[in-house]
Amino acid sequence: FNISGCSTKKLLWTYSTRSEEEFVLFCDLPEPQKSHFCHRNRLSPKQVPEHLPFMGSNDLSDVQWYQQPSNGDPLEDIRKSYPHIIQDKCTLHFLTPGVNNSGSYICRPKMIKSPYDVACCVKMILEVKPQTNASCEYSASHKQDLLLGSTGSISCPSLSCQSDAQSPAVTWYKNGKLLSVERSNRIVVDEVYDYHQGTYVCDYTQSDTVSSWTVRAVVQVRTIVGDTKLKPDILDPVEDTLEVELGKPLTISCKARFGFERVFNPVIKWYIKDSDLEWEVSVPEAKSIKSTLKDEIIERNIILEKVTQRDLRRKFVCFVQNSIGNTTQSVQLKEKRG
C-alpha cells in the first residue's frame, strides 16, 4: 500500500547502556479511524463528538505494524521478522534497546472499512541512541518502586536531571492510557495502591530550527511492601527426626519463607554433620514455589540415592539466610522398625 499519505511522527529513544529498558510505540491513528481500532482517541473535553467514536469496535488487535527497510525494499510485517518486538493490541513493545531498532514503523487498520481508511496510517520514525550525557549521573531508573501505603513519585528518566521549573510539559501514559492531568516530569502519588503498578510512558517535545520530535521513555513501576524485619522461617522439615528404610532412595525437602526485600539475596542450602565434621552438599538448584507481594517460599531438596547405616549417624541440616539473619533446622534419620 502507498505510505506517502501516512501522518508522520518522529520519536527519540535514548537508552542507558547500564540498564535493561523497554520501549513502546502507540498506533496513533488520525481521527476518527483510530477510535474504531485502538481506543486511543485524543479528543480534548471541548472536542468530544455527540456520538463518541471510541464506542466503535472493541477488537483491540485489528491494526497491522510494518517496518520500512532503509534500502527501499517492500514493507516487512513486524511479527514475522522481529522476534524482540512484540505487538500487544495497538502497542508495539521493544524488549531490548539498541541502535538497530532505529527505523520507520508504520501502523494501519487491518480491516479497510471505507475508501478513506486506505490512507489511514501512521508512520513513526524512531531514532535510537545510547545515552552519552555523563553530567547526569543519577538519572531516574527505568524500573521504579513505590512503597504501598506511603507517598511516592514516578520520575521521567529522560528529564530527571532537570528541575521542575526547567522541565518541558510532559505527557504521561499508564498501560497505554492517557493520564491527562499529569504534566510535570514527576508524578507524585499521595498514597500508593496496588493499581499504581504498571508501565508508564513519559513524552515531551524537543525541537531545533528544522523540526521537532517526541522524546519518549518507558518506566516499569512496581508496588512493593516495606523490607522485612524478620529472618526467614523454615516451614519444612518440622520434625527433627525422620523414619527411613535402609537401602531405599530418600528426598528431604527444605521449604523456607523469606519476607520481601528490595535487594533480595536468599540463601538456602543443605549441609551434613558427622561427628566433628560438617560439609555442604551439592544438591539440585533451589526453586521458588510461591511468590506474593509480601513473601516468597523457596524449596531446596537433598537427594540420597540410598540410605546407608552411616547416614543414620549423621545430621542433615537445612540453612536459610537473608540480610536480617539465618535459621537452621536439622534432621536425624531413624530406621523404620518392622
Epitope: P45, L52, F54, L178
Partner: antibody, heavy 125, light 110 residues
Framework: QEQLVESGGGLVKPEGSLTLTCTAS?????????ICWVRQAPGKGLEWIAC????????IYCATWAKGRFTISKTSSTTVTLQMTSLTAADTATYFC?????????????????WGPGTLVTVSS | DIVMTQTPASVSEPVGGTVTIKCQAS??????LSWYQQKPGQPPKLLIY???ILASGVPSQFKGSGSGTDFTLTISDLECADAATYYC????????????FGGGTEVVVK
C-alpha cells in the same frame, strides 16, 4: 443494544456471604471501560463500592470501607462479580452495576454512562 | 478516600424556576466530575461529564460548571419531569483510588 444486568441478590442472614454478578450484553469489556458496583440503601444516597479495569490487567479501585469484606473480580469478557462477606443489616441495599467510560484516558472521564436496573440484597435473620 | 460534599440536601422550586446545586471535593479533581439524575425505582442517569459536557440526549436546560474542588449544576426552566434526586461524582481516581459520590440533592418541582 448495550445493557448491564445484575443477578444474585436476595435474602441473606447476618454474617452470611453473597456473590453478585454483573452481565454485559451488546458490548464486551475492553480497555475503554471500568466496571463498577454502586449501592443504595432504602431511602438513602448512592454509595460507590469498587471498580475493576475491564481489560483484565487487574487494576482495582475500592472504597476504604469495603476493603476486606467486598471483592470485585472480572470472571469473563462479559461478567464481573462482587463477593460480599460478613454481611450486616447495614448492607441491605439495591446493588447497581455500572460502566465507567474512560475512552482513551486512564480514569472514567466520560462518567458512568450505562447502569443496570439493580438487584436487592436484604440482610436479615 | 476523596469526600464529595453536596449542598443543599433538598430544594423546592416552581415550574419554570431555576435550581443551583453545589458540590465540593476534598481535593482537586480538575474537571473530572459527573452529574447524575435518579428517579424513584430507577437507576441513575448520566447528565454531565467532565464538569460541563452534556451527555447524549440531555437537554440544554442542564448546565455544569466548575473545576478543581468546586462545582455547580444549574437546572433552568424547571419542568415536572425534572423532579428527582441529583448526585455528583468524582471521576479522577488515580491519586485517590476513589470514585466517590456526593450525598445527593432532592429537587421538588412545585
Amino acid at each position: 443494544q448495550e445493557q448491564l444486568v445484575e443477578s444474585g441478590g436476595g435474602l441473606v442472614k447476618p454474617e452470611g456471604s453473597l456473590t453478585l454478578t454483573c452481565t454485559a450484553s451488546g458490548f464486551s469489556f475492553s480497555s475503554s471501560y471500568w466496571i463498577c458496583w454502586v449501592r443504595q440503601a432504602p431511602g438513602k444516597g448512592l454509595e460507590w463500592i469498587a471498580c475493576i479495569y475491564a481489560d483484565g490487567s487487574g487494576s482495582i479501585y475500592c472504597a476504604t470501607w469495603a476493603k476486606g469484606r467486598f471483592t470485585i473480580s472480572k470472571t469473563s469478557s462479559t461478567t464481573v462479580t462482587l463477593q460480599m462477606t460478613s454481611l450486616t443489616a447495614a448492607d441491605t441495599a439495591t446493588y447497581f452495576c455500572s460502566r465507567g467510560n474512560a475512552g482513551s484516558y486512564w480514569d472514567i472521564y466520560y462518567g458512568m454512562d450505562l447502569w443496570g436496573p439493580g438487584t436487592l440484597v436484604t440482610v436479615s435473620s | 478516600d476523596i469526600v464529595m460534599t453536596q449542598t443543599p440536601a433538598s430544594v423546592s422550586e416552581p415550574v419554570g424556576g431555576t435550581v443551583t446545586i453545589k458540590c465540593q471535593a476534598s481535593q482537586s479533581i480538575y474537571s473530572y466530575l459527573s452529574w447524575y439524575q435518579q428517579k424513584p425505582g430507577q437507576p441513575p442517569k448520566l447528565l454531565i461529564y467532565q464538569a460541563s459536557i452534556l451527555a447524549s440526549g440531555v437537554p440544554s436546560q442542564f448546565k455544569g460548571s466548575g473545576s478543581g474542588t468546586d462545582f455547580t449544576l444549574t437546572i433552568s426552566d424547571l419542568e415536572c419531569a425534572d423532579a428527582a434526586t441529583y448526585y455528583c461524582q468524582s471521576n479522577y481516581g488515580f491519586s485517590s483510588g476513589s470514585y466517590a459520590f456526593g450525598g445527593g440533592t432532592e429537587v421538588v418541582v412545585k
